[in-house]
Interface confidence: low
Amino acid sequence: SEGRKTWRRRGQQPPPPPRTEAAPAAGQPVESFPLDFTAVEGNMDSFMAQVKSLAQSLYPCSAQQLNEDLRLHLLLNTSVTCNDGSPAGYYLKESRGSRRWLLFLEGGWYCFNRENCDSRYDTMRRLMSSRDWPRTRTGTGILSSQPEENPYWWNANMVFIPYCSSDVWSGASPKSDKNEYAFMGSLIIQEVVRELLGKGLSGAKVLLLAGSSAGGTGVLLNVDRVAELLEELGYPSIQVRGLADSGWFLDNKQYRRSDCIDTINCAPTDAIRRGIRYWSGMVPERCQRQFKEGEEWNCFFGYKVYPTLRCPVFVVQWLFDEAQLTVDNVHLTGQPVQEGLRLYIQNLGRELRHTLKDVPASFAPACLSHEIIIRSHWTDVQVKGTSLPRALHCWDRSLHDSHKASKTPLKGCPVHLVDSCPWPHCNPSCPTVRDQFTGQEMNVAQFLMHMGFDMQTVAQPQGLEPSELLGMLSNGS
């Protein structure tokens, strides 16, 4: 579209796609396909130890000298900025042997009017400005280059894009006399992709656009646009995929209705309605066409935008997401939960599960939490015996050329993993719950009682006595 072209850096066209990359010549290393763990499921620890030792012996330098850090690069095109006009940027750790690129969009809520953006600027400046960003960041979780921490994609080129546009990665409006703040989230992603083409992305086989929280929603809003951009620039063979973590929100009714005064108390629809106007937010074209003018806010909600997307997207979402509960005005303080609230929370899980039924690649544990993929212990949670890295590996396999035509899931390699048990933390691999009031860790039994769940009710569907359930949950916590 015409509007997008104006943001291309004049005189700095990316290099044309090198032909040798598309079809490697004889003797050129072709990156191998992700490891298939099927045969080693039983002894994962020893397998991972072997992988690590092999990886380290293949590196030209010792493990001690391996630098785990991603290094900051501010955008050369300084017209693509953070809210305050400082240049946006990205952190990069290259992995020269790999043709996989992981671009991660950071999360961090949003602001939707002058007042709450001013307040955000005062208290969370790094989410609106690049001027105090550290020069390096440690890659954790899916951004880690350690095979034990990241059995999924440890060898990929890692890119972390800090969130400094406060617009759920949707904006395309510069700072001006009229606009105190720039909202350029969508353009930041585009510009990062353009710059990375000159740093090796041009030879990529797969680009995985991932993100958590607002970054997860940013994935849904931008994944198709990134694919279009690469096609436009002459790189149609790069497969673009999305991984949206904790960004699949519901535009549901709040538990207690509240006025839209600040970011976290504002109902999801109200916040996005206001935001999209304030940011001049962009949504995917195909989704926009489904809603009439003024109704584009619908496209910020996963279950509405997902069916319109062309790129494959893997959705990761806690069934009882803390950010969703916050915007729904559910604040789990030190007080025991009332019956009405317990039912509201259970219903939220049910609704969320329902929205994922037609999402073939999804991982939704019945836990009360928020964000997962850049946590160091992202490998710990399982749904029906499958961990998230394993599910992502299965997804990769299902998307691999030989399976393109086939819609049937790979045997023993599931990609649709949604917990069916109906209350928070009924999955024993959930992360530890903290009392939001005291910060203390709670074991699951304590937590469920705090949530007002009658142990008899919880135990019955499991065919257990309450005492057995308590024992089982305490061991699982």
Epitope: D69, D122, T123, R125, R126, D132, W133, P134, T136, R137, T138, G139, T140, L143, F160, E371, I374, R375, S376
Partner: antibody
Amino acid sequence: EVQLVESGGDLVKPGGSLKLSCAASGFTFSDYGMHWLRQAPEKGLEWVAYISSGSTTLSYANTMKGRFTISRDNAKKTLSLQMTSLRSEDTAIYYCARKNYNGGYFDVWGTGTTVTVSS
Amino acid sequence: DIVLTQSPASLVVSLGQRATISCRASKSVSESGYSYMHWYQQKPGQPPKLLIYLASNLESGVPARFSGSGSGTDFTLNIHPVEEGDATTYYCQHSRVLPPTFGSGTKLEIK
């Protein structure tokens, strides 16, 4: 030049009171959260209190809660620490320090002012 | 409160060699890719001076001989090669949550 200068340190009797001040210059004082820290003779560093840029958040070390009060005047670019019910263990060099926006580390320190509590 | 255990309490290193100081936190001080651990140098009669912030970032004006690493609970400050003027006390500090706390300090001597 970015600078913090403390004043008000003195010799005071146990149970007495004292008010310390910290004058800031060379930066936009109202943009930054500020801390007081202290160091007893031949001892390590200990955090005392914190005040956010707009004074909306105040926080104190447990042993100082109820006895010390942190405040700031952004127009005058000053930070204060009112200390009451002083004890001998409050004897220390008191530093004011600027909190970096994002990391919570102390990127600028004052030179310190000495408080001695003794009968 | 998060307790920081710094070791060793004192350290003697030959001129030009490497000095390594460790700091262990009682709870993880890392979150979402940031490690909220910082290192300071304090010379007698002076306030502390920031050397390394967020585990591995060198404060501007600090010589590249100083470097920091670590994440979670274990952090290290390295000085290499050590110079005469480095003989003083070093502290680690976390800012993961209030209250921020400091390690008890490591006194570096040069021989």
